[in-house]
Amino acid sequence: VLEVYYTSLRCRCVQESSVFIPRRFIDRIQILPRGNGCPRKEIIVWKKNKSIVCVDPQAEWIQRMMEVLRKRSSSTLPVPVFKRKIP
């Protein structure tokens, strides 16, 4: 569910939302760390209805959710949760 990509692209998010999306309606979360042409961290959420939204990284709900997902992955998977794609 939780992925981190390092890309050489500029910022992907034009607009960010802080509107809560429950875990049950999220298909995938992609994290784009700042750098490589974008000065800010970006979080992209794929919803189960096939729509995509950029989420404000400061939104409390996404921070809590990512923490839960990190804990969940570290306790159930022998490999780290982050997938790194190096360009």
């Epitope: 809560f20 429950p22 875990r23 049950r24 919803k47 209805n49 709900w61 809590r64 839960v68 969940r72």
Partner: antibody, heavy 123, light 106 residues
């Protein structure tokens, strides 16, 4: 006191359409996502649809996707379910239920339910 | 899709008995499970969410436990008003209800 009152159920032929309504009161309707859940006679509960607080997002299980459409009118405190291409297996009591608080971050499930409206699909 | 296997499907017990119902998820759902009570001709009533969090006004004789895939719902001392059908619900990935447990008077 939270109140949810469903209406619009009835007898419809296979292939027909029906629109259910749910009137909400006793809470700030526009702050909550809402869902429809159904129960076939003598059977268990089955989730049918959910719509976000602002109405921009809707979610469905595969067996109703493309046939059912959930919508809402926050100005009227009303929730709707448009059901098309109805089948015999859609026969059930349909409940509307209050879902998660859209302005929060607590992932809570459906908490308050209406008394339901019966939809019978038969020729 | 996540499947929820609830057992038993029916149960006979007496007032004062301790009753346990289980739900098993087909995959890890963390703690995202709720329990509902439904009486004939009535709407379901939420008793517990997030595995063990009791809804306001629900008596403390109701409790829940578990995590991952295995969950338990317990009524510590059955009261006459507790005879009903109980359903579990997973809300980690969309929604799936268990098949229900009908609790009857012995």
């Amino acid at each position: 006191e939270v109140q949810l009152v469903e209406s619009g159920g009835g007898l419809v032929q296979p292939g027909g359409s029906l629109r259910l309504s749910c009137a909400a009161s006793g809470f700030t309707f526009s702050s909550y996502a809402m869902s429809w859940v159904r129960q076939a006679p003598g059977k268990g509960l089955e989730w049918v649809a959910t719509i976000s607080d602002g109405g921009s997002d809707a979610y469905y299980p595969d067996n109703v996707k493309g046939r059912f459409t959930i919508s809402r009118d926050n100005a009227k405190n009303s929730l709707y379910l448009q059901m098309n291409s109805l089948r015999a297996e859609d026969t059930a009591v349909y409940y509307c239920a209050r879902d998660y608080y859209g302005s929060g971050y607590e992932d809570s499930p459906m908490d308050y339910w209406g008394q339901g409206t019966l939809v019978t699909v038969s020729s | 899709d996540i499947q929820m296997t609830q057992s038993p499907s029916s149960l006979s017990a007496s007032v004062g008995d301790r009753v346990t119902i289980t739900c098993k998820a087909s995959q890890d759902i963390n703690k995202y499970i709720a329990w509902y009570q439904q009486k004939p001709g009535k709407a379901p009533k939420l008793l517990i969410h997030y595995t063990s969090t009791l809804q306001p006004g629900i008596p403390s004789r109701f409790s829940g436990s578990g995590s991952g895939t295995d969950f338990t719902f317990t009524i510590s001392s059955l009261q006459p008003e507790d005879f009903a059908t109980y359903y579990c619900l997973q809300y980690d990935n969309l929604y799936t209800f268990g098949g229900g447990t009908k609790l009857e008077i012995k």
